[in-house]
């Protein structure tokens, strides 16, 4: 997370850390708890060549990475069938946990938005994660969860910005309908935040608007952060994840 600050302990109870096996269980991406037994993340975190179940664990909301780990095994990894690269889209995946999480005030699910929600500019939105704090600058110990408020940008404006200084023709969309843009040169998500949630407060409820997907660098001029637009994939999500009663 570029800019922003350490998150208060009481906030973002749906935030999770994805861990890959190595000399230690290392954080590599974020995710969000959308059901007691399901985590939403980015497809590029776990695919297109899907990792072994044996190589992956989920850590629920923790203030500082690695300090009080209780790693959870995953029973299924589901990558969106249309995913190839983040820039092309469909950068979304689901992880099914072996056991449902015991929800509490400290750890619970985030609400998915209604299909009609567009998340217009001006809406109060935040992105969270344990990723880099600037381009090629790692989050330093004790690895606190960070948060930053990011401005939403309309897709057509974001697309125009991404065409500035790019070889892509103006008639070729860079920012597609299944994407959402947020951030500026002082506030952005970065490497290691991928898969984590962009949430917006709508009528007093936090809704997950996006999944951290891609961008050219972090907090670069004319290059806002790009997120997978959750509303675009609600039907796909609910094909696997039970709706709340």
């Amino acid at each position: 997370i570029v800019g922003g600050q350490e998150a208060p302990r009481s906030k973002w109870p749906w935030q999770v850390s994805l861990r890959v096996h190595g000399p230690y269980w290392m954080h590599f991406c974020g995710g969000s708890l959308i059901h007691p037994q399901w985590v939403l993340t980015a497809a590029h975190c776990v695919g297109p060549d899907v990792k072994d179940l044996a190589a992956l664990r989920v850590q629920l909301r923790e203030q500082h990475l690695y300090y009080q780990d209780q790693l959870l095994p995953v029973s299924r990894i589901i990558v969106h069938p249309q995913f190839y690269t983040a820039q092309i889209g469909a950068d979304i995946a689901l992880l099914e946990l072996e056991e449902p999480v015991n929800v509490s005030s400290h750890v619970h699910t985030v609400t998915l938005p209604p299909a009609s929600e567009t998340f217009p500019p001006g809406m109060p939105c935040w992105v969270t994660g344990w990723g880099d704090v600037d381009n090629d600058e790692r989050l330093p110990p004790p690895f606190p969860l960070k948060q930053v408020k990011v401005p939403i940008m309309e897709n057509h404006i974001c697309d125009a910005k991404y065409h500035l200084g790019a070889y892509t023709g103006d008639d070729v969309r860079i920012v597609r309908d299944d994407m959402l843009c947020a951030g500026n040169t002082r506030r952005d998500s970065c490497q290691g935040d991928s898969g984590g949630p962009l949430v917006c407060k709508v009528n007093g409820t936090w809704l997950q608007a996006g999944v951290v997907s891609w961008g050219e660098g972090c907090a670069q001029p004319n290059r806002p952060g790009i997120y997978t637009r959750v509303t675009y994939y609600l039907d796909w999500i609910h094909h696997y994840v039970p709706k709340k009663p």
């Epitope: 037994q37 899907v50 072994d52 179940l53 044996a54 095994p73 029973s75 990894i77 072996e98 056991e99």
Partner: antibody, heavy 119, light 106 residues
């Protein structure tokens, strides 16, 4: 001592049913995913089914799906395999095994129980 | 489903020989697991996460590989190594074992 002891095997007619049990001791049973593996006479190992620590997740080999049911009773430290519609090709030694928590290999095995399906 | 193919199915070797068993997965996996079984006995964990030796396994055993091709190697075969070895993946369910490789005395 960490131990798994299977029981319940025996001779059963084709189409019949049998329930295998596996008694666990020497470890906190409720912390571990458990697995059944079988081995037909003179043949190799075949994975049968998996059950997660709290029974929320179960998976079966395709040939066993719909006929076999894996379950557990954490209060009794016991794993079960209910086998219905048994066929001659289900004749095998059935092993109960524990999945290592950190590294997911099958680190503790029972001695096995022989199931013979024959008329 | 991922299929596992071991080769050879059996091999004859002498004490002191270097022995290599291969396991091929039908699609890419991250890790391979190996078990040793002797006649009339339960299998024992032998190698996990491709190259880590299970407790009590002698250092003459090693594991390697990535993607679809993995190997178990015995640098200098000893009398107690004559057994059947099975590979297994933990990529996704259903889990599958290879058909086994029987190491016999020449």
């Amino acid at each position: 001592e960490v131990q798994l002891v299977e029981s319940g095997g025996g001779l059963v007619q084709p189409g019949g049913s049998l329930r295998l049990s596996c008694a666990a001791s020497g470890f906190t049973f409720s912390d571990y995913g458990m697995v059944w593996v079988r081995q037909a006479p003179g043949k190799g190992l075949e994975w049968v089914a998996f059950i997660s620590s709290g029974s929320s997740t179960v998976y079966y080999a395709d040939t066993m799906k719909g006929r076999f049911t894996i379950s557990r009773d954490n209060s009794k430290n016991t794993l079960y395999l209910q086998m219905n519609s048994l066929r001659a090709e289900d004749t095998a030694v059935y092993y109960c095994t524990r999945r290592n928590y950190d590294d997911v290999y099958f680190d503790v095995w029972g001695q096995g129980t022989l199931v013979t399906v024959s008329s | 489903d991922i299929q596992m193919t071991q080769s050879p199915s059996s091999l004859s070797a002498s004490v002191g020989d270097r022995v290599t068993i291969t396991c091929s997965a039908s699609s890419s996996v991250t890790y391979m697991y190996w078990y040793q079984q002797k006649p009339g006995k339960s299998p024992k964990p032998w190698i996990y996460r491709t190259s880590d030796l299970a407790s009590g396994v002698p250092s003459r055993f090693s594991g390697s590989g990535s993607g679809t091709d993995f190997t178990l190697t015995i640098s200098s075969l000893q009398p107690e190594d004559f057994a059947t070895y099975y590979c297994q993946h933990y990529h996704s369910y259903p889990l599958t074992f290879g058909q086994g490789t029987k190491v016999e005395i020449k």
